[in-house]
Each structure stands twice: as C-alpha cells, then as structure tokens.
C-alpha cells in the first residue's frame, strides 16, 4: 500500500501581512493527480473554501478580494486525489494590519545613538493594548514581540537595545494588537530612523536584547515562542 499523499505547499501573494481592504491570493500547490483543493482555517466551523484545480491541476487559487478581520488567521490546505485527501500543508498565518489606530514610535533618549551606548524604542498606543510588535525594515525576521502578562492592557511597550551596534541602525515601525487575535494588528506607526554613529563595533547583539535577525522569509511575521519577564510585559522572540 502506498504511503500518505505528500503535503501541498501553501503561500500568499503579495505576502502574508495584508492591509485592511487590500486583495490577497492564497495558493495551494499539490500534484497533477489533484481533483479538488480545500482550504481550512484554524477553528473554523466548516471548510473555509474549496476550489477545483487550475490546469494542469497541480494548484488552486483562493482569492480574497478585500482583506477584512474575517480572513485573518491560520490556514492549511489539502488536495484530494483518487486515493483520498493529502496530508495538510504547513500552516500559513495571514495577518491583517489596519485593525486599530496607529501607535507612536519614539527613541529614548534620541534616535541618534553612539555605538556601544543604549537606546530604548518606545511604542505608545492611544488606547490600552496588550501586544506590541517592533518591525525593522529589511531584516530577515523583522520583529520583537512584547505581550503584557495576565492580559493586563498597557498604553506602551519599551524595546531596550544595549549595547547598540551598527546592526541596530535602520528604519523601524511598531504595531499594537489585542491578545484575542494575534492576526489583527494596528496600522503601522510612522517610521523611525535609528542612526548609529561611531566606530565602536561590539559583538552581534543577542536575541534576548535586541531585534532578531535570524534568516527567514520577509513576509512572515514572527509568532511568539520564548519569553522572559520584562517590566510587566513578556518579551517574545524567535
């Protein structure tokens, strides 16, 4: 007897972080024997969508013409061949930005910092939120994640960086979110340019102290894995 059908590949175009109202296409690629493709959303009461394959039958397109809260979440896809349903694909996490008003990002004491010194990026929201995310442009894994403990909501989160090196220089944005859905983020803050001056080049920062730069796809948001207590918030990195 043949083994289980190989799992399909699932991805989103133009990416998996989509602004409210924008369109996104989810693709599921299986095999040429596929007769039907099914997209399941985590904790949905029924199959999320089902599509016939596009010729030559090895993939299907699931279109979202206008991104809303309904579509944010974690997806897997399957294909059905004459011998049954495949294994599930690896999950795709579709994140919607624009769910809440934008926070403010600032640098303390200043966005101009000398190499070897300390700087704290401060993300502040108008209304209390329980999750704050820091994004660095063009970083492979562009995010730090602070979540308040015990669901306590706060107006701000601090992202300390010490000691600062040239690696920290660049453009940052932050987002805020509510804990009930990690897939719904605020509008992004206005960008903050962190400029690192001086030639003191220290060691590469450890992920517990600054922005993670682990390799990974640009459009995939980091989801929380590890944590350490930090001033009423939990810090998560990957």
């Amino acid at each position: 007897q043949a083994g289980p059908l190989p799992k399909p590949t699932l991805w989103a175009e133009p990416g998996s972080v989509i602004s409210w109202g924008n369109s996104v296409t989810i693709w599921c690629q299986g095999t040429l024997e596929a007769r039907e493709y099914r997209l399941d959303k985590e904790e949905s009461p029924a199959p999320w969508d089902r599509q016939n394959p596009l010729e030559p039958k090895n993939k299907a397109r699931f279109s979202i013409p206008s991104m809303t809260e309904d579509y944010a979440g974690r997806y897997r896809c399957y294909y059905r061949s004459p011998v049954g349903w495949s294994q599930p694909s690896d999950p795709l996490e579709l994140v919607m930005t624009g769910a809440y008003s934008k926070p403010t990002l600032s640098a303390l004491p200043s966005p101009l910092v000398t190499s070897g010194k300390s700087v704290t990026l401060l993300c502040q929201s108008r209304s209390p939120m329980d999750t704050f995310l820091l994004i660095k442009e063009r970083a492979a894994h562009p995010l730090l994640h602070l979540r308040s403990e015990h669901g306590a909501q706060q107006h701000q989160a601090e992202f300390p960086m010490s000691p600062v090196t040239s690696v920290h220089g660049g453009t940052y944005r932050c987002f805020s979110s509510h804990g009930f859905s990690h897939y719904l983020l605020s509008h992004p803050s206005d960008p903050l340019e962190l400029i690192v001056s001086g030639s003191l080049e220290g060691p590469r920062p450890s992920p517990t102290r600054s922005v993670s730069t682990a390799a990974g796809p640009e459009d995939q948001p980091l989801m929380p894995t590890g944590s350490v207590p930090h001033s009423g918030l939990r810090r998560h990195w990957e």
């Epitope: 009461p45 199959p47 969508d49 089902r50 349903w85």
Partner: antibody, heavy 122, light 110 residues
C-alpha cells in the same frame, strides 16, 4: 427544492438506543455539511452535532459527546444520528439542518427539516 | 460552557427598525464566532437568515442584516413587516461547537 426529512423518532426507555435518519434531496448532498439540532418541549434550540461534507470532521455538543455518533452515506443522500445511553433530558424534537459548502460560500443552518420527536421515558 | 444570551422579546411596528442582540458569556463576540441567525415561524418552521461571513441566505429580504455592535452580535430588521413576526435565534461558534441563544420573540404590531 431543498428538502430534509427526518425519521426514526419514537418512545424509548432510558439507557436504550435509537438511530435517526435524515434523507436529503434537491441539492448535491455530498458537497454540504449537515447538522443535528434539537428542541426540548417548550425550550429553545440546542445544537447537537455536525459532520463535514466528506465525513472528515465531526463535532459534538458536550452534552452528547461519547453517547451520540453522527455519520453520513453520501451514496444514499442520508445523514444519521446514532443515539446510545439515552437519558430523559434527550427528549426533544430532532432536526437536521444543512451546513455550508464552505465558509466563504453559504450560511450554516440555511435549510431545516420538519423534525422527528424522540421521547425518552420509562 | 459558554452561554449565549438574547432579549426574550421585542415589539415593533410595521416600517420601524428593530435590532436584536446576541451576547456571549465568554466575552466580546468576534468574527471568529461566525454569528448566525435563524428564524422560527409557527409550526416549528426554521429558516436560516444570515451567517458565515456576513452572507445572507438567498431569498432572504435585504431588510435583514447582521453585524457586530460593541461586544455583541446583532440582527437588524430595517423596515419590519408583519410577516417578520417570529422567534429569532442566534448561534455562536466556539472553536469546536455551536451554542444557540434562547431566542427573541419579535412581535410586529399591525
């Protein structure tokens, strides 16, 4: 037109079993999920169970989990509810209701049958 | 277990707008609860109205609309008709099971 017809109800003693059927017509049965929902005399609705279009997923209310089994035979356009270890509180009219092809197409509970009465009494 | 609460009864007049709500004991109703609305007419005739992802059942008049208002799900009948007199049930999804509310009896005084 869409039709759902329940059968198999009746009077049964506590602890005994009963199997309900729901015959579907007027739509492609094998592409839709189907629910069982019940209504005790003079009470509101209580969701019982759902089965996906191909039988791959089944969900149950806590009150019936481990006692009731939902199943379907797509070749016969028929849904079943096997009810074991029946209790007095299972007394109700049992309805089957159509689910969706998928969440982005359709509305759960759009079409309902007329119901079949199950009375659990000694 | 989650409890879903609805107004027990509401009265309106033809042409008026009436809003029914559906509250969850677990907190705010969100899009992940996939709020559903079902109408019961006399003789236990049930019909789905609205649900899934803001879909309306084909044939259901446009005066019926669903939404989230504050922390509750809502069914609004804009310009009620006498034939809208019925009991309306909401159902919310909780990760692996549905829970129905107790139903709202809507009376349309002609």
């Amino acid at each position: 037109q869409v039709q759902l017809v329940e059968s198999g109800g009746g009077v049964v003693q506590p602890g005994r079993s009963l199997r309900l059927s729901c015959a579907a017509s007027g739509f492609t049965f094998s592409t839709y999920g189907i629910h069982w929902v019940r209504q005790a005399p003079g009470k509101g609705l209580e969701w019982v169970a759902v089965i996906w279009f191909d039988g791959s997923n089944k969900y149950y209310a806590d009150s019936v989990k481990g006692r009731f089994t939902i199943s379907r035979d797509n070749s016969k356009n028929t849904l079943y509810l096997q009810m074991n270890s029946l209790r007095a509180e299972d007394t109700a009219v049992y309805y089957c209701a159509r689910d969706v092809i998928s969440m982005v197409r359709g509305v759960p509970f759009d079409y309902w049958g007329q119901g079949t009465l199950v009375t659990v009494s000694s | 277990d989650a409890v879903v609460t609805q107004e027990s009864a509401l009265t309106t007049s033809p042409g008026e707008t009436v809003t029914l709500t559906c509250r969850s004991s677990t907190g705010a109703v969100t899009t992940s609860n996939y709020a559903n609305w079902v109408q019961e007419k006399p003789d236990h005739l049930f019909t789905g109205l609205i649900g899934g992802i803001n879909n309306r059942v084909p044939g259901v008049p446009a005066r019926f609309s669903g939404s989230l208002i504050g922390d509750k799900a809502a069914l609004t009948i804009t310009g009620a008709q006498t034939e809208d007199e019925a009991i309306y049930f909401c159902a919310l999804w909780y990760s692996n099971h549905w829970v129905f509310g107790g139903g709202t009896k809507v009376t349309v005084l002609g």
